[in-house]
């Protein structure tokens, strides 16, 4: 004989669990239906009547199958420095992301951003690393030999020094090399390519905003261990 299909509510067999999209109601001591995403429990089940579900009201949601008596409130509207990447619907919370030039300093459980901060800027001698800090902020790395950055920017990377046949001023981490004009009388001399070496540079990024976890890490060019620079108040 085929097994009987139990309709909710039903008492589970001893030691067994309720089926998918059901829950065990400890008061009724029955397996009862959950409500679908976008709904909540309006009336809990009894021993003889199943759960009654109702749609979430405006600005509230449930994302999962559930038996909550009230839907969750959607997060507040995105602030002026954010963009709404997911609207509040009956089945999902609003998600806010930071606009360009900012990173998320404080995330909610749902992945929305609660607080955006301006991206840190890397000063001369430092370029933006290809990877980001765990919090999404810019990582600055000292320009490696043969490269430089002469800007204060949250996007600029270290660029290679120009290659001179005759070097007038060597480049360093914060300035490009300056080439000497070629003399016609020296044009027969075999060319030597000069790649300048960087001079020691400070390792302090510029333009810090106070706030949570927003000090960028500085990656040295001497190894893989990052040096965490602490922001200090004052000059």
């Amino acid at each position: 004989l085929p097994a009987q299909v139990a309709f909710t509510p039903y008492a589970p067999e001893p030691g067994s669990t309720c089926r998918l999209r059901e829950y065990y109601d400890q008061t009724a001591q029955m397996c009862c239906s959950k409500c679908s995403p976008g709904q909540h429990a309006k009336v809990f089940c009894t021993k003889t009547s199943d759960t009654v579900c109702d749609s979430c009201e405006d600005s509230t949601y449930t994302q999962l199958w559930n038996w909550v008596p009230e839907c969750l409130s959607c997060g507040s509207r995105c602030s002026s420095d954010q963009v709404e990447t997911q609207a509040c619907t009956r089945e999902q919370n609003r998600i806010c992301a930071c606009e360009a030039g900012r990173y998320c300093a404080l995330k909610t459980h749902s992945g929305s951003c609660r607080q955006c901060m301006r991206l840190s800027k890397c000063g001369p001698g430092f370029g933006v690393a290809s990877s980001r800090a765990p919090n999404g902020n810019v990582l600055c790395k000292a320009c490696a030999p043969g490269t430089f950055s002469d800007t204060t920017s949250s996007t600029d990377v270290c660029r290679p020094h120009r290659i001179c046949s005759i070097l007038a001023i060597p480049g360093n981490a914060s300035t490009d090399a300056v080439c000497a004009p070629e003399s016609p009388t020296l044009s027969a001399i075999p060319r030597t390519l000069y790649v300048s070496q960087p001079e020691p540079t400070r390792s302090q990024p510029l333009d810090q905003e106070p706030g949570p976890s927003q000090t960028p890490s500085i990656l040295t060019s001497l190894g893989s261990t990052p040096i965490i620079e602490q922001s200090t108040k004052g000059g």
Partner: antibody, heavy 119, light 106 residues
Amino acid sequence: QVTLKESGPTLVKPTQTLTLTCTFSGFSLSTLGMGVGWIRQPPGKALEWLAHIWWDADKYYNPALKSRLTITKDTSKNQVVLTMTNMDPVDTATYYCARMTGTRYFDVWGQGTTVTVSS
Amino acid sequence: DIQMTQSPSSLSASVGDRVTITCKASQNINKFIAWYQHKPGKVPKLLIHYTSTLQPGVPSRFSGSGSGSDYTLTISSLQPEDVATYYCLQYGVLWTFGGGTKVEIK
């Protein structure tokens, strides 16, 4: 407007059976999700839940008192009746009936009736 | 059965004080807790249900919080009319009231 009112004897003798009636208006026990429960409060003590009946006649009792309690409803009369057998002086209390919502909390209470158990 | 341990059993505070009452359940009650205000000679009045949902007409100085087995009722600024006994009710598994907290004005 939702109202509930308890009625019954004010004095019962030990070993007797207490019968209390809750008469309500402003809602119906034939409406999905509606329920009525009984709660008592002995003098100087905390509230204690006794029993509950739903619109679909499903009943729940306080496990400590289950053997002594019976709850019934008369939907047409808008009444719920609680009987409690083998009364004892420790059962002296104010007895309340209250409406219960579909999500199981009491939202509106009756004024209460005082029952004294004494010989 | 679920036991509800309510504390303190009584308290005395000044008008304007912040008052906190706690209820601890003997197991997880999934936020199914309500709070009632009971004044002498009056009917118990529902203040809050499902941990933090304020009943219509209840002053905003009353608030509820908690999860799992620990729950709190807070009166942010005690008023003379708040003198009463307050009870928690768990309704996660059957129904159990806490022992009550008598609130008085100093």
